[in-house]
């Protein structure tokens, strides 16, 4: 769900943690339209995930903490 | 309906551990956050961290980061919640609270509609 | 010290509207995370009033509503009720820190 480097929409799947190696955020008032989190996997895809949704914000923090103990 | 049943008051030593539960009933265990409030005497509501079942792995807020360890058993649909290297400072009352809609909510996200009876925890020597 | 900022106290006499404020900053309310509320009555666990900036859960009387703007929000009360006197808690997300967070609380007297 995304086009020149910007989701347009989100996932609709739960991803694991486990499947995923990193995150680079989207910001709405930097060229793209909607907010997102852009989820990397071991297998080189990027997945465009809502935000707001508890489980991405779960990852999100997990995947920070990850960053920190490195 | 949903009912969060934790467990009962702890009297401990400083220095010593504690493990509060919380078991869930009236609802899928696994599609839902789980989290644990700290509330000190007189004081306000310290969210500590929280659990997805299904994911396994816990997150917490920077502050308790070290001190509390979050689990979850989803054959008896209770979370847990132990802190270690009890002071004087950890006397609170601890509540186990559940998210109104599943993990992959967004309007609901954070909305934590269930709560526990809450669980006093007094560290005194 | 909160994330979230609330005013220690607020009053207001039966039957009158009070409003309890909740300032954030860019990484939580103003950065369109949705904001919670709860009410907490002397000696019970706190109790979902208000979620998604502007919902009631079933059971809550519409006497109580939400609202966001910016970098805060606001939580109204009309037709006050001796019985609404309690703690009153905002919530919201805050993205650099990765975890939600509670304003500090804000004591509603009813004169």
């Known amino acids: 769900a995304s086009n020149f480097d910007c989701c347009l929409g989100y996932t609709d799947r739960i991803l694991h943690p486990k499947f995923i190696v990193g995150f680079t955020r989207q910001l709405a008032n930097e060229g793209c339209d909607i907010n997102a989190i852009i989820f990397h996997t071991k297998k080189k895809l990027s997945v465009c995930a809502n935000p707001k949704q508890t489980w991405v914000k779960y990852i999100v923090r997990l995947l920070s903490k990850k960053v920190k103990n490195m | 309906e949903v009912q969060l049943v934790q467990s009962g008051a702890e009297v401990k030593k400083p220095g010593s551990s504690v493990k509060v539960s919380c078991k869930a009933s009236?609802?899928?265990?696994?599609?839902?956050?789980f989290s644990w409030v700290r509330q000190a005497p007189g004081q306000g509501l310290e969210w500590m961290g929280g659990?997805?079942?299904?994911?396994?792995?816990?997150i917490y807020a920077q502050k308790f980061q070290g001190k509390v360890t979050i689990t979850a058993d989803t054959s008896t649909s209770t979370v847990y919640m132990k802190l270690s290297s009890l002071r004087s400072g950890d006397t609170a009352i601890y509540y186990c609270?559940?998210?109104?809609?599943?993990?992959?909510?967004?309007?609901?996200?954070?909305?934590?509609?269930?709560w526990g009876r809450g669980t006093l925890v007094t560290v005194s020597s | 010290q909160a994330v979230l900022t609330q005013p220690s106290s607020v009053s207001g006499a039966p039957g009158q509207r009070v409003t309890i404020s909740c300032t954030g900053s860019?990484?939580?309310?103003?950065?369109?995370?949705?904001v919670q509320w709860y009410q907490q009555l002397p000696g019970t666990a706190p109790k979902l009033l208000i979620y998604g900036n502007n919902n009631r859960p079933s059971g809550v009387p519409d006497r109580f509503s939400g609202s966001k703007s910016d970098r805060s929000a606001s939580l109204a009360i009309t037709g006050l009720r001796a019985e609404d006197e309690s703690d009153y808690y905002c919530?919201?997300?805050?993205?650099?820190?990765?975890?939600?967070?509670f304003g500090g609380g804000t004591k509603l007297t009813v004169l």
């Open positions: 860019r990484s939580n309310i103003g950065a369109d995370y949705d």
């Open positions: 659990i997805i079942p299904m994911f396994d792995t816990p």
């Open positions: 919530q919201s997300y805050d993205s650099s820190l990765s975890v939600w967070v």
């Open positions: 009236g609802d899928t265990f696994d599609s839902y956050a």
């Open positions: 609270a559940r998210e109104w809609g599943g993990y992959y909510s967004s309007e609901s996200s954070g909305a934590l509609q269930y």
